[in-house]
Amino acid sequence: CHHWLCHCSNRVFLCQDSKVTEIPPDLPRNAIELRFVLTKLRVIPKGSFSGFGDLEKIEISQNDVLEVIEADVFSNLPNLHEIRIEKANNLLYINPEAFQNLPSLRYLLISNTGIKHLPAFHKIQSLQKVLLDIQDNINIHIIARNSFMGLSFESVILWLNKNGIQEIHNCAFNGTQLDELNLSDNNNLEELPDDVFQGASGPVVLDISRTKVYSLPNHGLENLKKLRARSTYRLKKLPSLDKFVMLIEASLTYPSHCCAFANWRRQTSELHPICNKSISRQDIDDMTQPGDQRVSLVDDEPSYGKGSDMLYSEFDYDLCNEFVDVTCSPKPDAFNPCEDIMGYNILR
């Protein structure tokens, strides 16, 4: 483990400071990590890392003269699971062919760069769950259709916060299993079109905090479990609650929006088919005490949870509960009540 220009320990190579003006061609091919920090690299040329079969991580950080990443830079690296490209304000261009065939990729960070367009991810084809972390790229204005198709065969988390995103096209997330989508702090983002999630499964978590989004899409919210829309002042109304089949947590801007969830009943069609198998809707209604938010069975039932009573053994009370317990904030209070404020004598 030795190199004339780059520091090294246990197959980790750190090429650091202004003396590094190009990727050294003689870096050992058995390296497991490469870090290029505070260098004067202007270009990362085609095939810079070819042959690094053991490579697991690449970091390219604080390179203030870096302008271009060429094709085939992150390509055919079977063990590469982490790429970090950050703090390169003059990086304006990442070749569409830069990322290819990275079956082990789990984390890709691109932050504080000058790029104007999302790189092409369609040839990455990871076999792992991927966290794509794209932040603080103020020149990225548009998320085009199919932007993330081919990124992973597994589910993905997309952190697209603090960019300059102004426009997201229909089918932008087509082909993805979207566990989480964070669009927060894109201050000029106004619209999520109705078909933005067309072809995607998810998102399960959606964050549009501190954007100018004024409406949520009418389609694609079926899997949404957590919605975050803090300081999203233009979001004055939510879609019909029957769009939120799976919602369990909402962090919103206006307390009045939480009122909608207070006494919300799921539609019959939204209950799982198993709910009709062991116990009837009427039985549930009978067991529901007035004012209760949850179905509660008698506490002294000795066989509950033990599986010996077939009446209850296959029954999932959360799944089949027609009342939805959504944790919502900010909670309504005396100054932001759910009722018409004229109903309060003291205020009237």
């Epitope: 190199h3 220009l5 520091h7 090294c8 320990s9 750190l14 870090r35 970091e59």
Partner: antibody, heavy 120, light 111 residues
Framework: QVNLKESGPGILQPSQTLNLTCSFS??????????VGWIRQPSGKGLDWLAH???????RYNPALKSRLTISKDASSNQVFLKIASVVTADTATYYC????????????WGHGTTLTVSS | DIVLTQSPASLAVSLGQRATISCRAS??????????LNWFQQKPGQPPKLLIY???NQRSGVPARFSGSGSGTDFSLNIHPMEEDDTAMYFC?????????FGGGTKVEIK
């Protein structure tokens, strides 16, 4: 095979200027990644890094002595020089010339040292 | 400046046994995953000789009985099995930041 050899005056009086020369072979200071430095060791004591110079003429000094130190090189003749102004008795030590590899800042090869005594 | 404190100041070890020298830095000498900590051996009348660089990497030609470990602020040099020829002073040195500094040294001898 790398060799480094230090030469100096041996004895100086306080306030005089120390001029040290390191003559080396087996590598070139024109080669990227190469550097030469100076380290001193008072008799029976620890080691103090003084200064070094890289192939690209980039120089680094120990801040505690910076005002008195000057390092320079003549790559064509494979020599590095260190000047220490206004010596005092505390400068009495063995002075080593060292080949430094930029990768890991490794002190790869050392000269045998030259002894300086500062005495009035 | 980064201060390196070595302990013990001296150490007597039986032949074939393990000698362990500690080096503690006043602040971390790690940078982007690499520890800029080296170990030197110095015998009387000779210049120091590099044994270990970047905390745990053995310089070529150095016997395998010398090994280094640690990260951040705490490092150690192990000699095992101890041989007669290993009687010497051992110094740690950091090159994370200027001024590059050395530990005060540990004298190792045969018991």
């Amino acid at each position: 095979q790398v060799n480094l050899k230090e030469s100096g005056p041996g004895i100086l009086q306080p306030s005089q200027t120390l001029n040290l020369t390191c003559s080396f072979s087996g590598f070139s200071l024109s080669t990227s990644g190469m550097g030469v430095g100076w380290i001193r060791q008072p008799s029976g004591k620890g080691l103090d890094w003084l200064a070094h110079i890289w192939w690209d003429d980039d120089k680094r000094y120990n801040p505690a002595l910076k005002s008195r130190l000057t390092i320079s090189k003549d790559a064509s003749s494979n020599q590095v020089f260190l000047k220490i102004a206004s010596v005092v008795t505390a400068d009495t030590a063995t002075y080593y010339c060292v080949q430094i590899n930029y990768g890991n800042y490794r002190f790869d090869n050392w000269g045998h040292g030259t002894t300086l005594t500062v005495s009035s | 400046d980064i201060v390196l404190t070595q302990s013990p100041a001296s150490l007597a070890v039986s032949l074939g046994q393990r000698a362990t020298i500690s080096c503690r830095a006043s602040e971390s000498v790690d940078n982007y995953g690499i520890s800029f900590l080296n170990w030197f051996q110095q015998k009387p009348g000779q210049p120091p000789k590099l044994l270990i660089y970047a905390a745990s990497n053995q310089r070529s030609g150095v016997p395998a009985r010398f090994s280094g470990s640690g990260s951040g602020t705490d490092f150690s040099l192990n000699i095992h099995p101890m041989e007669e020829d290993d009687t010497a002073m051992y110094f740690c040195q950091q090159s994370k930041e200027v001024p590059w500094t050395f530990g005060g040294g540990t004298k190792v001898e045969i018991k």
